[in-house]
Interface confidence: medium
Amino acid sequence: AGTPPGKAFNLTWISADFKTILAWQPKPTNYTYTVQISTKSGDWKYKCTGTTDTECALTDEIVKDVKQTYLARVLSVPWRNSTHGKETLFGTHGEEPPFTNAPEFTPYLETNLGAPTIQSFEQVGTKVNVTVEDERTLVRRNNTFLSLRDVFGKDLIYTLAYWKSSSSGAKTAATNTNEFLIDVDKGENYCFSVQAVIPSRTVNRASTDSPVECMGQEHHHHHH
């Protein structure tokens, strides 16, 4: 009958701005993997059937409703059963192949925030308006892709660190829109970096910093 397939372990959700994969170990030898995903009240859906990879893209499933809690499991399927689709995933006596459950995953609560991008900054006198790009996600509504702000609404804020090019002491500001209006000293050039933050989260609360943008490198009215 051959060696029974090994069970997957270290099942991990890897998710940034809702782009989501499930990863696991080990690399299979005489068997393949099939992933199943469902909501708590839904039916199992087959993904990555018969794969020898150790990851499976599940973005298209979780973006259907990012506030749902998703269950997933990785089935280890012997070669003889893995080549003809799900009808033959089960053994000749109908037994279920070995599987490992992934931790529950609620995208809205857990997806990592990707580093934001400073879209533009514009100085008028002693004020600078810094605009953060409203990043598009893969979450759809009415056939259009929603931005991070569309999805998270008032749960999302941005924080800005800014400092004079000639010094290292940074000041900070926060906004629950995508724009900052800050006071600066006339004749000084400033550098800026922003972070996306969901203050009421306990995990994956903040993104990494955006790339630093500085005034005076091109001109004060600066657009990407």
């Epitope: 708590k40 506030k67 749902q68 609620t106 609560l109 008032k154 804020i157 629950n176 203050p199």
Partner: antibody, heavy 118, light 107 residues
């Protein structure tokens, strides 16, 4: 430990105003919206509005918009709800409640009883 | 605004038996539903959010289900301390609205 401590009971005459306070502790005050919910005697729960302690911006239930004002004092981690032009049907227990990520109210104050009577 | 209708208004269940409370939204709220428990003289307590997620510290005899317009709170084995009024609330669209409440008692 997260705590929301509200001010004491109030008795008011019709037409007067009442200002209820809610002092927060045990968490990052500016990170969570604060909501106000009221409950008339023997009745259900009714949402009045919410305030962002970080900016002071507020959103009100249309029903109360003309009469309610929510404010914040960051220095004392306190939010306030003032209701004006009181009438007998405003007799209720008024709760402050912290809005959790995604919308639900995870922590509630102990409630403040407001009685409107001539 | 979205109207939340709870049923039944009251429910008497024997200790150890299952209690089921229903909540219907006047339009789809996706899974934007929370359930609260309120004991006499106390503030409400959050039990369930996102329709089916148990809040921190909530016993696993409490479970929620549903999507769209129809939702259910189930207490799988009623305990004496579960006597309370239970409310559903939609947090999908402002103004946030609550159901009228269901009183759960011991039979």
């Amino acid at each position: 430990e997260v705590q929301l401590v509200q001010s004491g009971a109030e008795v008011k005459k019709p037409g007067a105003s009442v200002k209820v306070s809610c002092k927060a502790s045990g968490y990052s005050f500016t990170g969570y919206y604060m909501n106000w919910v009221r409950q008339a005697p023997g009745q259900g729960l009714e949402w009045m509005g919410e305030i962002n302690p970080s900016t002071g911006g507020s959103t009100y239930n249309q029903k109360f918009k003309a009469r309610v004002t929510m404010t914040v004092d960051q220095s004392t981690s306190t939010v306030y709800m003032e209701l004006s032009s009181l009438r007998s049907e405003d007799t209720a227990v008024y709760y402050c409640a912290r809005r959790e990520l995604g919308g639900p109210f995870g922590y509630w104050g102990q409630g403040t009883t407001v009685t409107v009577s001539s | 605004s979205i109207v939340m209708t709870q049923s039944p208004d009251s429910l008497a269940v024997s200790l150890g038996e299952r209690a089921t409370i229903n909540c219907k939204a006047s339009q789809s709220v996706s899974n934007g539903i929370a359930w609260y428990q309120q004991k006499p003289g106390q503030s409400p307590k959050l039990l369930i959010y996102f329709a089916s997620n148990r809040y921190t510290g909530v016993p696993d005899r409490f479970s929620g289900s549903g999507y769209g317009t129809d939702f259910t709170l189930t207490i799988s084995s009623l305990q004496a301390e579960d006597v309370a009024v239970y409310y559903c609330q939609q947090d999908y669209s402002s103004p946030w609205t609550f159901g009228g409440g269901t009183k759960v008692e011991i039979k």
